[in-house]
Amino acid sequence: TVPPMVNVTRSEASEGNITVTCRASSFYPRNIILTWRQDGVSLSADTQQWGDVLPDGNGTYQTWVATRICRGEEQRFTCYMEHSGNHSTHPVPS
């Protein structure tokens, strides 16, 4: 088992909004849960966009999940990762 490296980034979207992207890379096996939480609970699937789980060329995999949020409310969002029985949460950088 190779645990993922998780990285959260933000980019400007429409006025007053930002897109936050959570990327998991260099993990094996390929089964992974990567999702956004808002206010500590699951963010509905229809407000998230997932990338495919793809090989990254080193025998490991990568994927991502993104959502759009209001600027100033970053604290309310965390990216949740679960892989091979391990869990971690990752805040939006300020």
């Epitope: 500590g40 609970v41 604290q75 309310r76 969002f77 949740y80 679960e82 869990h87 949460t89 805040p91």
Partner: antibody, heavy 119, light 107 residues
Framework: DVQLQESGPGLVKPSQSLSLTCTVT?????????WNWIRQFPRNKLEWMGY???????NYNPSLKSRISITRDTSKNQFFLQLISVTTEDTATYYC????????????WGQGTLVTVSA | DIQMTQSPASLSASVGETVTITCRAS??????LAWYQQKQGKSPQLLVY???MLADGVPSRFSASGSGTQYSLKINSLQPEDFGSYYC?????????FGAGTKVEIK
Amino acid sequence: DVQLQESGPGLVKPSQSLSLTCTVTGYSITSDYAWNWIRQFPRNKLEWMGYINYSGTTNYNPSLKSRISITRDTSKNQFFLQLISVTTEDTATYYCSYYRYDGAWFPYWGQGTLVTVSA
Amino acid sequence: DIQMTQSPASLSASVGETVTITCRASGNIHNYLAWYQQKQGKSPQLLVYNAIMLADGVPSRFSASGSGTQYSLKINSLQPEDFGSYYCQHFWSFPLTFGAGTKVEIK
């Protein structure tokens, strides 16, 4: 360490309002987290009532939405529960707690305060 | 709302025994589950979060597992301080709800 302490009257008459205070020490309620009220009925059933978060946003249990209000006094680092039109069914031990945004579980609770609704 | 059904409602066990408590959600909660222990007259204390993760200071004789709608809490070699009530709680969506509890008593 975050510490929470509930206070308020232990006896309320039916149809009146129940008002409780949670005093938080060790952490500013405006810094982060969701600050919650949870109650436990005499037969031990637990019910999440709602929260006010670090920015003042509230979220209530729909079963209570028409009767509940959670407010705060940031200068005193306190948050409050008001429940209107109480009945004997609101007799319970009331706890304040908080959760971080990595997940809505409750790492620490106040010691609880028993409120009896009776004429 | 997601309903949480705990079983058994109560159990009697001896010190040193292994006990298992189960919690069933009315819908898939995707491991968004916590377990608490409550002693008589005290506040609940967090034992487990994210379905399987032990909270700080929780002894390793406690373990938790599950997925989807079915979850369990196992106590190996029950100790005198383990007697009390245990509650599950989901945090998949609002409103947050708790199981009705399992009372673990001394046989």
